[in-house]
């Protein structure tokens, strides 16, 4: 899987997860959250040759003839496969708010 | 949606659905499908800004973050996600197969 | 264990290209990020530019004319360029890491590189 | 740029003693900063980031904390070691910069 384990310990061009810190005032302009100050985004970054962790059929077969015509800018990408929510603390007034946001942190990625 | 009813009938820089002719036997070598010769394939290009079509939480907060630090490449990507199966003629031997190969056909796209 | 070691030439004649390497090991250059920081003698630190994971480059905007920043992930090496030094540019140069991608500070530093630009 | 300024320039302290660095960031840098330690002839060492987070293997006499735009180092019992030159740096926006540097000397 081209997740932590893998990818932060290899030098690894082609598609993999990359370390990125997100810091919510600073980096979104968000000031609305209160805790955390920031958290580990992560994404997807690298090539997508033939076979390197090809996500479907057509992704493939993409990346098969992208070997061809490469001129066609017709490969695929690297994206996020598995997400997991972050916890946020927020508030409404003077009232401390608890809620998950769904799909904010890139655990693994995939070529698609 | 992506797809192309939108795309086909705009000029749109931005992520978007790209038609693509693929041969078998030209572009990926595959000389043993009988039938088609070839399909229309597709596939998914394009920038993504801000709130284009973001396909989760974690693909809006990059592309966000991503207006302000371009040269991280930590940009979400245009690809694929509705897919469909394309029908194939093939022979073992002398024996016609028919088989329904899935995900080989993009019908939209989105920024992931 | 990580550890980031800078190398070249200590003495670079005025207006020619100042040359410098960064060899790193225990960690990826497609993981983190390393940046270039220097310090004249006696004087405080100034950051001058950085190189990511994905090979992206940001520079200190005081001195994006002159400097160049790319790096070999293969060997696990980071190079500076800096053109058209002067006098201004004697000090010891180092190369550090950031502990995550756009986290900005740096816990892990080379040990230095003194270049001293004279005729 | 964003300029950051140190005080005192040097600050005299005996062994055993508190010692309070102060840095002020001249706009709002919303708790990027940290704070480096170098000793002659060697490079920095990051002691605190995000403020207040102490890095790890570093002693817990080192504190950060901060007020409005005035961001403090404190040592709260200086051991002979601990005699050296001490760096505030923004991580909030490039470029980054830092401030010139307190020298902590023995009294």
């Known amino acids: 899987a081209l997740d932590a384990a893998y990818c932060f310990r290899n030098v690894q061009d082609n598609c993999c997860l990359r370390p990125l810190y997100i810091d919510f005032k600073r980096d979104l302009g968000w000031k609305w959250i209160h805790e955390p100050k920031g958290y580990n985004a992560n994404f997807c970054a690298g090539a997508c040759p033939y076979l390197w962790s090809s996500d479907t059929q057509h992704s493939r077969v993409l990346s098969l003839y992208n070997t061809i015509n490469p001129e066609a800018s017709a490969s695929p990408c690297c994206v996020s496969q598995d997400l997991e929510p972050l916890t946020i603390l927020y508030y409404i007034g003077k009232t401390p708010k608890i809620e998950q946001l769904s799909n904010m942190i890139v655990k693994s990625c995939k070529c698609s | 949606a992506l797809d192309a009813a939108y795309c086909f009938r705009n000029v749109q820089d931005n992520c978007c659905l790209r038609p693509l002719y693929i041969d078998f036997k030209r572009d990926l070598g595959w000389k043993w499908i009988h039938e088609p010769k070839g399909y229309n394939a597709n596939f998914c290009a394009g920038a993504c800004p801000y709130l284009w079509s973001s396909d989760t939480q974690h693909s809006r907060v990059l592309s966000l973050y991503n207006t302000i630090n371009p040269e991280a490449s930590a940009s979400p990507c245009c690809v694929s996600q509705d897919l469909e199966p394309l029908t194939i003629l093939y022979y073992i031997g002398k024996t016609p197969k028919i088989e329904q190969l899935s995900n080989m056909i993009v019908k939209s796209c989105k920024c992931s | 264990e990580v550890q980031l070691q800078e190398s070249g030439p200590g003495l670079v004649k005025p207006s020619e290209t100042l040359s410098l390497t960064c060899t790193v090991s225990g960690f990826s250059l497609t993981t983190y990020n390393v940046h270039w920081v220097r310090q004249p003698p006696g004087k405080g630190l100034e950051w001058m530019g950085l190189?990511?994971?994905?090979?992206?480059?940001r520079y200190n905007s005081a001195l994006k004319s002159r400097l160049t920043i790319s790096k070999d992930t293969s060997k696990s090496q980071v190079s500076l360029k800096l053109s058209s030094v002067t006098a201004a540019d004697t000090a010891v140069y180092y190369c550090?890491?950031?502990?995550?991608?756009?986290?900005?500070?740096?816990?892990?530093w080379g040990p230095g590189t003194l270049v001293t630009v004279s005729s | 740029e964003i300029v950051m300024t140190q005080s005192p320039a040097t600050l005299s302290v005996s062994p055993g003693e508190r010692a309070t660095l102060s840095c002020l960031a001249s706009e709002d840098i919303y708790s990027n900063l940290a704070w480096y330690q170098q000793k002659p002839g060697q490079s920095p060492r990051l002691l605190i980031y995000?403020?207040?987070s102490l890095q790890d293997g570093v002693p817990a006499r080192f504190s950060g904390s901060e007020s409005g735009p005035e961001y403090t180092l404190t040592i709260s019992s200086l051991q002979s070691e601990d005699f050296a030159v001490y760096f505030c740096?923004?991580?909030?926006?490039?470029?980054?910069?830092f401030g010139q540097g307190t020298k902590v000397e023995i009294k």
């Open positions: 550090a890491r950031d502990p995550v991608p756009n986290k900005w500070h740096f816990d892990f």
């Open positions: 190189i990511w994971n994905t090979g992206g480059t």
């Open positions: 740096q923004q991580h909030h926006a490039y470029p980054f910069t």
């Open positions: 995000d403020a207040r």
